[in-house]
């Protein structure tokens, strides 16, 4: 049950996360907010109404409205959480499970082409899982991961945009490109 | 008045199965955390199993692919299907109500459960 | 999984003298502690949670301390009727468990 119902959620390497609550309104009704780290099995953050809020580190922090924030993701953040949220009388009111997953943005990605053989190469150097697209005055080409090598015959001279995504950032590059009618660099 | 009774217990032979009942009255049942606690011969308490209000099960590493706890809210009952049973699973099994997921606030009376051949 | 160890194993005291049980955790876990009573024949009883919180229905004389690693139970002024084991349980980590337990004997 736990994984099936779980939020898929991303976060950047090195960037803060929330991990927000969906279709939860705080109340005076609730007395204890609960964050566990499935794999470590264990209770990360806590908050108790009237009393003083428990956190594991100091790279979590638990807002009233029951969010936590982990702050610099690192690798081992990866994981399956889990919110519990309880009334004054104990009962639990509403659970939720957040599937964590952590990516490292990708890079500006890096276009070079040669005239000699009008063939243009377009890269990425990091991130996690990058898709490539390649385009040529605003028509896409191809799609690749992280090395895209396109030989264009159309014309001598275009604009080209390589762009650079995954699930936690975008960039993208543009290089107008213009070759003598010899084919020379 | 929070009121736990617990049934099903009995003498059963290694490898043998069990379905361990919980009655529960007196509180809003589907709403609360519930857990199995077991006390040994030895007096030693070992918390089981837990389901929470919502579904989700945890167990003891021990247990875990032998014993399945489940609860029907409509008749607020609480299980404890165990199967595989070994002789270190003798014991005294309780039933607990588990406010905030955690405080065992109340107990049953208890099932006693002996495994051997 | 966490281990918790309760001292003495068994605690004499005479009728209205203070006792106080002790319950040490292998790791820090802030003050997710709750001690429970055992009558010779009974079940479990909640006393104290989350430490140092009282519970309704439980006499004044029962009180708790403690946070991190490090936790007591006390009762100021024993009565017979406190004849009994007395077990600290920790809900930090899964799987949640217990102290051996004190018992309590009146001399």
């Known amino acids: 049950k736990e994984i099936t119902n779980a939020l898929e959620t991303w976060g950047a390497l090195g960037q803060d996360i929330n991990l927000d609550i969906p279709s939860f309104q705080m109340s005076d009704d609730i007395d204890d907010i609960k964050w566990e780290k499935t794999s470590d099995k264990k209770k990360i953050a806590q908050f108790r109404k009237e009393k003083e809020t428990f956190k594991e580190k100091d790279t979590y922090k638990l807002f009233k409205n029951g969010t936590l924030k982990i702050k610099h993701l690192k690798t081992d953040d990866q994981d399956i959480y889990k919110v519990s949220i309880y009334d004054t009388k104990g009962k639990n009111v509403l659970e939720k499970i957040f599937d964590l997953k952590i990516q490292e943005r990708v890079s500006k990605p890096k276009i070079s082409w040669t005239c000699i053989n009008t063939t243009l190469t377009c890269e990425v150097m990091n991130g996690t899982d990058p898709e490539l697209n390649l385009y040529q005055d605003g028509k896409h080409l191809k799609l690749s991961q992280r090395v895209i090598t396109h030989k264009w015959t159309t014309s001598l001279s275009a604009k080209f945009k390589c762009t650079a995504g995954n699930k936690v950032s975008k960039e993208s590059s543009v290089e107008p490109v213009s070759c003598p009618e010899k084919g020379l660099d | 008045e929070v009121k736990l009774v617990e049934s099903g217990g009995g003498l059963v032979k290694p490898g043998g199965s069990l379905k361990l009942s919980c009655a529960a009255s007196?509180?809003?049942?589907?709403?609360?955390?519930m857990s199995w606690v077991r006390q040994t011969p030895e007096k030693r308490l070992e918390w089981v199993a837990s389901?929470?209000?919502?579904?989700?099960?945890y167990y003891l590493d021990s247990v875990k692919g032998r014993f399945t706890i489940s609860r029907d809210n409509a008749r607020n009952i609480l299980y404890l299907h165990m199967t595989s049973l070994r002789s270190e699973d003798t014991a005294m099994y309780y039933c607990?109500?588990?406010?905030?997921?955690?405080?065992?606030?109340?107990w049953g009376q208890g099932t006693s459960v002996t495994v051997s051949s | 999984d966490i281990l918790l160890t309760q001292s003495p194993a068994i605690l004499s005291v005479s009728p209205g003298e203070r006792v106080s049980f002790s319950c040490r955790a292998s790791?820090?876990?802030?003050?997710?502690i709750h001690w429970y009573q055992q009558r010779t024949t009974g079940s479990p009883r909640l006393l104290i949670k989350?430490?140092?919180e009282s519970i309704s229905g439980i006499p004044s004389r029962f009180s708790g301390s403690g946070s991190g690693t490090d936790f007591t139970l006390s009762i100021n002024s024993v009565e017979s009727e406190d004849v009994a084991d007395y077990y600290c349980?920790?809900?930090?980590?899964?799987?949640?468990?217990f102290g051996g337990g004190t018992k309590l004997e009146i001399e």
């Open positions: 607990a109500r588990s406010s905030y997921g955690e405080i065992m606030d109340y």
């Open positions: 007196g509180f809003t049942f589907s709403s609360y955390d």
């Open positions: 389901i929470s209000g919502g579904g989700f099960l």
């Open positions: 790791q820090r876990i802030g003050t997710s």
């Open positions: 989350y430490a140092s």
């Open positions: 349980q920790q809900s930090h980590g899964w799987p949640f468990t």
